[in-house]
């Protein structure tokens, strides 16, 4: 199916930028892995590079505004021609759910006191209003609550006195049109406007003041333009060469508004001065290699020694990584393929341990499934031996940091009948549904 092809993918927003055009295949658009595509206008934007997970979205608002609720976030597998994490198709969302609490308590309504006395009438003549008030303290509301209804009420009052009405101008009427629209005629063009003393008219009994100033205004029409000439397009120029050496590019034709040139405020030519076409080199663009994540550290060993585990003897270990995805003469990965460090082996060493504090509460699992729960743990943590943190392995090469490696066997006093891990679980409350934000926009 044809797609819309774009020249850029914005990682921060996940949006396609720089529309190249439509009606091309995904395969042609993605000859250049810096490009991106949409299956339909306004749809999900997918970059042409190999798939990887987007950043996690921000947490959605808490499902309730007070007491404990839950909130979701997601990330999306974005890219083309491959999978994330070995098996996840591009476009797929992964969800996480956690507990939240915007406000510990929920608002409670208060009650009103009795009404206070009426205040004096708001005017000294004709009709006005008077007001009375009451307090929200019977009882006072709690946790940001309020009282139902209004804290004050008003009613009409009549002073039995007639008020005088002073005159005021209505707004000016429109200017009369000028006698000519272009300059150079036999008469000097003039324009006039008027207004009425009717907003309101002054009263007779008791007498009100008349409107101040004049009811008419006249002025000369100035700056009238010469009569206009509309512009017209010249012919289209030659098509520019395809500006790229690989993938899709954009060629352009131009024309000039000079057939004739617009004069004296005449309209500019309607339509575009340029038009573009997609050009296809049918050549794939180079794809630079990208390092995979580092592999596991190899076991900590020392040459010519069977085992250095549980001893104050420094060894060495290494880890490697693979340069993946390099195609069509792209750059090789920069940096080292192997990483070496010095280490003490504590693999399977019995070590004295101590119980950690409670961890923070984990995510709710399953996030979109039935009855999600969250958990926290206390772990039996090993006390590491006080071996020197740096060593000098080779004369003249300076001190090197030494890292502990391996899984020891920590020993703690039993806690709640457990020797290694104590776990506490809680249900997650007010769980919202997992909905694809792209599907909600449709």
């Amino acid at each position: 199916d044809p797609v819309l092809c774009f020249t850029q993918y914005e990682e921060s927003s996940g949006k396609c930028k720089g529309l190249l055009g439509g009606g091309v295949s995904v395969e042609d658009c993605c000859l250049n892995t810096a490009f991106a595509y949409q299956k339909r206008s306004g749809g999900l934007c997918q970059p042409c590079r190999s798939p990887r997970w987007s950043l996690w979205s921000t947490w959605a608002p808490c499902s309730v505004t007070c007491s404990e609720g839950s909130q979701l976030r997601y990330r999306r597998c974005v890219g083309w021609n491959g999978q994330c994490s070995g098996k996840v198709a591009p476009g797929t969302l992964e969800w996480q759910l956690q507990a939240c609490e915007d406000q510990q308590c929920c608002p409670e309504m208060g009650g009103w006191s009795g009404w206070g006395p009426w205040e004096p009438c708001s005017v000294t003549c004709s009709k006005g209003t008077r007001t009375r008030r009451r307090a929200c303290n019977h009882p006072a509301p709690k946790c940001g609550g309020h009282c139902p209804g209004q804290a004050q009420e008003s009613e009409a009052c009549d002073t039995q006195q007639v008020c005088p009405t002073h005159g005021a101008w209505a707004t000016w009427g429109p200017w009369t049109p000028c006698s000519a629209s272009c300059h150079g005629g036999p008469h000097e063009p003039k324009e006039t406007r008027s207004r009425k003393c009717s907003a309101p008219e002054p009263s007779q009994k008791p007498p009100g003041k008349p409107c101040p100033g004049l009811a008419y205004e006249q002025r000369r029409c100035t700056g009238l333009p010469p009569c206009p000439v509309a512009g017209g397009w010249g012919p289209w120029g030659p098509v520019s060469p395809c500006p790229v050496t690989c993938g899709l590019g954009q060629t352009m034709e131009q024309r000039t508004c000079n057939h004739p040139v617009p004069q004296h405020g005449g309209p500019f030519c309607a339509g575009d001065a340029t038009r573009t076409h997609i050009c296809n080199t049918a050549v794939p663009c180079p794809v630079d290699g990208e390092w995979d994540s580092w592999g596991e550290w190899s076991p900590c060993i020392r040459r010519n020694m069977k085992s250095i585990s549980c001893q104050e003897i420094p060894g060495q270990q290494s880890r490697g990584r693979t340069c993946r995805g390099r195609k069509f003469d792209g750059h090789r990965c920069a940096g080292q393929q192997q990483d070496i460090r010095h280490c003490y082996s504590i693999q399977h060493c019995p070590l004295k341990g101590s119980w950690s504090e409670w961890s923070t509460w984990g995510l709710c699992m399953p996030p979109c499934g039935p009855n999600p729960t969250r958990a926290r743990q206390r772990l039996c943590t090993p006390l590491l031996p006080k071996y020197p943190p740096t060593v000098s392995m080779v004369e003249g090469q300076g001190e090197k940091n030494v890292t502990f490696w391996g899984r020891p066997l920590p020993r703690c006093e039993e806690l709640q009948g457990q020797k290694l891990v104590v776990e506490e679980k809680r249900p997650c409350l007010h769980v919202p549904a997992c909905k694809d934000p792209e599907e909600e926009e449709l």
Epitope: A89, L93, P370
Partner: nanobody, 130 residues
Framework: QVQLVESGGGLVQAGGSLRLSCAAS????????MGWFRQAPGKEREFVAA????????YYADSVKGRFTISRDDAKNTVYLQMNNLKPEDTAVYYC???????????????????????WGQGTQVTVSG
């Protein structure tokens, strides 16, 4: 090891209905994504429908939308495929599949591919006569 066992297939006339069931052994069924695929003679295996988890969306192939309905009962460890208004082109062996990965995903392209599913049933034959 979890096992999937399909049932409910058979011979039916065009326009008729069938309900397929897939029973799973194992306690963590509610956290599995479940799907139905089918394979007609001489053709490749194709996606029919999927239900990720109890509260998730449901996904259907265009060819069965509006006619087939997928549902699950976590208390019985069973997923169902209700097939109405059957056509001769629905004739195939129907397979039940489960994705037992720890991820919680949503998206048609994920569930319509065979790759995520790591457990498969033996299949049940559905034949629709013209």
């Amino acid at each position: 090891q979890v096992q999937l066992v399909e049932s409910g297939g058979g011979l039916v006339q065009a326009g008729g209905s069938l309900r397929l069931s897939c029973a799973a052994s194992g306690r963590t069924f509610s956290s599995y994504a479940m799907g139905w695929f089918r394979q007609a003679p001489g053709k490749e295996r194709e996606f029919v429908a999927a239900v990720p988890w109890t509260y998730g969306s449901k996904y259907y192939a265009d060819s069965v939308k509006g006619r087939f309905t997928i549902s699950r009962d976590d208390a019985k460890n069973t997923v169902y495929l209700q097939m109405n208004n059957l056509k001769p082109e629905d004739t195939a062996v129907y397979y039940c599949a489960a994705d037992s990965s720890a991820g919680y995903y949503s998206g048609f392209d994920y569930y319509s591919a065979a790759t995520p599913y790591d457990l498969w049933g033996q299949g049940t034959q559905v034949t629709v006569s013209g």
